[in-house]
């Protein structure tokens, strides 16, 4: 069962799934000037059996100008940098090590992928939040949201994370607050 809405937004925070439940869809979006190849699937789907889950279909982008030039899936370093920060890339590798039954890992990037990934989550999915760079957690309550089914409708639980740009008097310049996410979870969707 797909979740009706996107996970809640938290000001000055991003959210990220460490692993994606079977049934999750990821749109095959291309950056400006590129489009999905004609024969390409509009989305990738997390599928699996009892022992193994993986993404069905591959996203492929081609230049809108060129007719039939399909590109390899491995991104060039320059394009990777454009898509996400280096820090985020290393954090994503952390997520790749996670192996949960019935879940897929973060799909690797494809060349000329759009800046932001659009996922369609399913009931039972958990996403984790952390304050973006330059902001700190004023309050560090449960920093996650779970898509639940109640009374036949899906809803995401409300994360109790408050991020602020105001520095606390006790904090010395250059002293950094640890980010509000368990085990330095990777970031993804920007919440504002």
């Amino acid at each position: 069962e797909l979740c009706d809405d996107d996970p809640p937004k938290i000001t000055h925070a991003t959210f990220k799934a460490v692993a994606y439940k079977e049934g999750t869809m990821l749109n095959c979006e291309c950056k400006r000037g590129f489009r999905r190849i004609k024969s390409g699937s509009p989305y990738m789907l997390c599928t699996g059996n009892s022992s193994h889950s993986s993404w069905d279909n591959q996203c492929q982008c081609t230049s809108s100008a060129a007719r039939n030039t399909t590109k390899q899936v491995t991104p060039q370093p320059e394009e990777q940098k454009e898509r996400k920060t280096t820090e985020m890339q290393s954090q994503m590798q952390l997520a790749d090590q996670v192996s949960l039954p019935g879940h897929c890992r973060e799909p690797p990037p494809w060349e000329n992928e759009a800046t932001e990934r659009i996922y369609h989550f399913v009931v039972g999915q958990t996403v984790y939040y952390q304050c973006v760079q330059g902001y700190r957690a004023l309050h560090r309550g449960p920093a996650e949201s779970v898509c639940k089914m109640t009374h036949g409708k899906t809803r995401w639980t409300q994360p109790q994370l408050i991020c602020t740009g105001e520095t606390e008097p006790s904090q010395f310049p250059g002293e950094e607050e640890p980010q509000a996410s368990p085990d330095g979870l990777p970031e993804s969707e920007t919440s504002r």
């Epitope: 938290i10 004023l138 309050h139 560090r140 309550g141 994360p159 994370l161 602020t164």
Partner: antibody
Amino acid sequence: QVQLVQSGAEVKKPGASLKISCKGSGYTFTDYAMHWVRQAPGQGLEWIGVISTYSGDAIYAQKFQGRATMTVDTSTSTAYLELSSLRSEDTAVYYCARGVTFDYWGQGTTVTVSS
Amino acid sequence: DIQMTQSPSSLSASVGDRVTITCRASQDISNYLEWYQQKPGKAPKLLIYNAKTLAEGVPSRFSGSGSGTDFTLTISSLQPEDFATYYCQHHYDTPYTFGQGTKLEIK
């Protein structure tokens, strides 16, 4: 069930200080930040500030900066609001409210400032 | 600070009516908006959070919509217990501010 129970009504003289409490029960107190909101007679709602029940870190509305102090005692699951240099305009009902979306509120504490 | 402006300030309606209250933010607040109901002598009660999510235990005749700067609270069929004052509030960033309120009265 979730409950926020506030201390009783107070009558104070101008220039005095005031400390009101809000005790949370039925949930993990440190999971939710606590906000303070006030409402003058016949008026709307005014946000005073928010405190982290986890760290004690707080942010105040500019109007209350320096005059309001929010604190928490996690051992008793209680949040406190202290207001100093009281004036007649501080006459209001003071509420505590829980979490990002203010999903539960205390019953209110009526504060009267009068000479 | 972000200003929240509600309209109308007061409204007379009858049981069974469909009622709409609007709230406008002075800048884009995405969907960081709540609606509360307050009855005389009582604390406010959360009705809608994140612009459109119905709070637990709130009847389905209440609904919220909007994003950015313009938001709406709709009561599809007024019940006697719905006569109260309604407030919108943003939690986009501190300071959180409330609308001035809309008093819903019996016609």
